[in-house]
């Protein structure tokens, strides 16, 4: 079989379930610093009608609030529309549904355009295995290693997970 790694084998449904945020990257460092709008952490995901539904954890006032977001499908298989702090074109850049997922977003907010990338894994004990893949995606969207933030347990709202 030859082709392209466009979508998860078996479709978006394979992305359903629990995920853990491992790393973030952005060309605007403030967005992913503590209290930045995109310093958010994945809790779980599900897919329905080609749309992606995500529960994310947002640090607020020393606690973590769970918020549900929906990324709506577009005519392009790996692209979704997401409204969160402005409009986001969300792309699935590299996916292995059983192991890891790398997405990036082009955010438009108040006439300002930003780039944010996110690495999430199924099993936190294997997070180091997928950082090279994340660095590769970041390079290919014009982000540098020094623009990547690798998260710690304290960062990612681990205490808020059920």
């Amino acid at each position: 079989q030859e082709g392209n790694h466009e979508e998860p084998q078996g479709g978006l449904e394979e992305l359903s379930g629990r995920w853990h945020s491992v790393a973030l990257a952005s060309n605007k460092s403030d967005l992913i610093k503590p209290w930045g709008h995109f310093r958010v952490f994945i809790h779980s995901m599900s897919a329905k009608d080609g749309n992606l539904h995500g529960d994310i954890l947002i640090p607020q006032d020393g606690q973590c609030e769970k918020v549900s977001l929906t990324a709506f499908k577009t005519a392009t298989s790996n692209k979704f529309d997401l409204e969160y702090w402005g409009h986001n074109d969300l792309y699935l850049a590299e996916v292995d549904p059983k192991s890891y997922l790398i997405l990036y977003m082009i955010n438009q907010y108040n006439d300002d355009t930003s780039l944010v990338a996110h690495l999430m894994v199924r099993d936190l004990s294997r997070q180091q295995d997928f950082l090279p893949a994340f660095e590769s995606v970041c390079e290919d969207i014009g982000l540098h290693k020094d623009q990547i933030v690798v998260l710690s347990d304290d960062d990612r709202c681990q205490g808020s997970r059920d």
Epitope: T76, N78, K79
Partner: nanobody, 121 residues
Framework: EVQLVESGGGLVQPGGSLRLSCAAS????????MGWYRQAPGKQRELVAT????????MYADSVKGRFTISRDNAKKTVYLQMNSLKPEDTAVYYC??????????????WGQGTQVTVSS
């Protein structure tokens, strides 16, 4: 083994055009991203353009937006870079990069050997 072979470089006058090609060959199961980078003398390598998966999603460096177009032919495992309105500052060695799986679940980055583009009158 996987090989990336670039072609299409050369000498062109300012305002001119060139089309670069990069063909992947060898043991290939899947190809994800294909893209172009460049390195000018004394400078760091920089991203020019990337084509994600089927080519519906692309990313360009600000310096080439509106002048360069990346495209790909998946059947031929080839990525192209159409460069128009070339400027002297586009002079560099242009490298192809591809994210390739030789078997399911294993991804690696592969680079071509580079092709020289010189923009000069």
């Amino acid at each position: 083994e996987v090989q990336l072979v670039e072609s299409g470089g050369g000498l062109v006058q300012p305002g001119g055009s060139l089309r670069l090609s990069c063909a992947a060959s060898g043991t290939i199961f899947l190809i994800n991203r294909m893209g172009w980078y460049r390195q000018a003398p004394g400078k760091q390598r920089e991203l020019v353009a990337t084509s994600f998966t089927s080519g519906n999603s692309t990313m360009y460096a600000d310096s080439v937006k509106g002048r360069f177009t990346i495209s790909r032919d998946n059947a031929k495992k080839t990525v192209y870079l159409q460069m128009n309105s070339l400027k002297p500052e586009d002079t560099a060695v242009y490298y192809c990069k591809a994210r390739i799986s030789r078997r399911y679940g294993n991804w690696d980055d592969y680079w071509g050997q580079g092709t020289q583009v010189t923009v000069s009158s």
